[in-house]
Amino acid sequence: LIIGFGISGRHSITVTTVASAGNIGEDGILSCTFEPDIKLSDIVIQWLKEGVLGLVHEFKEGKDELSEQDEMFRGRTAVFADQVIVGNASLRLKNVQLTDAGTYKCYIITSKGKGNANLEYKTGAFSMPEVNVDYNASSETLRCEAPRWFPQPTVVWASQVDQGANFSEVSNTSFELNSENVTMKVVSVLYNVTINNTYSCMIENDIAKATGDIKVTESEIKRRSHLQLLNSKAS
């Protein structure tokens, strides 16, 4: 969490941002809140990016104002116009690109004063893994697949029964470049699995950590997966 304060002659206002991550090719949100004003026409929101000449987005007098917008953000940004009055200056970003990563500034002017806060935005690719029993294999084998990751993640297997065991000798992980030549498909195979055990396939890079669990018993197979972003820090 980054909390910024204004430093002008006018009163300063508190602006709060939260570091976040964007999944390339999908839509992202850059979070920013501020002390609200009673009049929408008195609020100015400017989003800036370090190293970029033009603005990312500007909203003033109740409308978007993109005359100074940098070309790399054309057609890709919007604020939640109906929520500005309650202090939400968050930016919606369409079709997140790898190059969108960097330091952003959320700069606010209201009738109460000015304030700003920085936000670190990471970009990459992350997806939920799915673990299945590989019936085509000669031995009892599990296959963990996740369609989109970038940068290249690490893959670690774990088991409930053999806690702390190192499965690197009995697993094989491959990374296959996807058609857009950036993200990769992750496939990891675990051999010699035993029945009545829960196995976890953990995929992690510097942006996200995802886990796919599978419980195999005589009578059924249960699956569960979850994904967690690693860098959601507020400012």
Partner: antibody
Framework: QVQLQESGPGLVKPSQTLSLTCTVS??????????WSWIRQHPGKGLEWIGN???????YYNPSLRSRVTMSVDTSKNQFSLKLSSVTAADTAVYYC?????????????WGQGTLVTVSS | DIQMTQSPSTLSASVGDRVTITCRAS??????LAWYQQKPGKAPKLLIY???SLHSGVPSRFSGSGSGTEFTLTISSLQPDDFATYYC?????????FGGGTKVEIK
């Protein structure tokens, strides 16, 4: 509500420049929340997006036509314009002007009624 | 450029039928897809934006679904006024592109 109306010559000679204007009524072209687009439709065929312009004059053109397209805006007249140079018979089409829904969502509404431009000597 | 492929190109149906038109994108476009209806000699009319949001004034028999690369437009009960050509359009990235169209005609 906002309405758009295309105007310009219906007949252009090959190698010349096609010029069209879109007049906006019921709203201001200077409203910063929108991009303004040109779209064309060849006879009996599908739709092709030509490009868009912001009220400040910044533009984005479809790369397939970029070398021949120029768009401009006249905020005092609430108009934006399209020029397409070095036309051939392949540029014969109905030309539409349209407004995007917002700065981030460029689904198009409203549209002008369209104007047929024929390229022929 | 992102290619948009519509199917079928022509669809014969009767009043009251449930009609489904498919649009496929050559790469993921998230939910940035619009659907239009066009009648001969007229400009296209926006029906659906952001894949599933019904545009104001459009009858509720029209609905859109899908995300990523596969999208559908459904007309729950075809009305006489619905015989027209339908286009999808992606606005995920420049240049914006349209599908080839689906003509819905009377069976």
């Amino acid at each position: 509500q906002v309405q758009l109306q295309e105007s310009g010559p219906g007949l252009v000679k090959p190698s010349q420049t096609l010029s069209l204007t879109c007049t906006v009524s019921g709203g201001s072209i200077s409203d910063g929340s929108y991009y303004w687009s040109w779209i064309r439709q060849h006879p009996g065929k599908g739709l092709e997006w030509i490009g868009n312009i912001y009220y400040s004059g910044s533009t984005y053109y479809n790369p397939s036509l970029r070398s021949r397209v120029t768009m401009s805006v006249d905020t005092s007249k609430n108009q934006f314009s399209l020029k397409l140079s070095s036309v051939t018979a392949a540029d014969t089409a109905v030309y539409y002007c349209a407004r995007g829904l917002s700065t981030i969502d460029e689904a198009f509404d409203p549209w002008g009624q369209g104007t047929l431009v024929t390229v022929s000597s | 450029d992102i290619q948009m492929t519509q199917s079928p190109s022509t669809l014969s149906a009767s009043v009251g039928d449930r009609v489904t038109i498919t649009c496929r994108a050559s790469k993921s476009i998230s939910s940035w897809l619009a659907w239009y209806q066009q009648k001969p000699g007229k400009a296209p009319k926006l029906l659906i934006y952001e894949a599933s949001s019904l545009h104001s004034g459009v009858p509720s028999r029209f609905s859109g679904s899908g995300s990523g690369t596969e999208f559908t437009l459904t007309i729950s009960s075809l009305q006489p006024d619905d015989f027209a050509t339908y286009y999808c359009q992606q606005d995920n990235s420049y240049p914006y592109t349209f599908g080839g169209g689906t003509k819905v005609e009377i069976k």
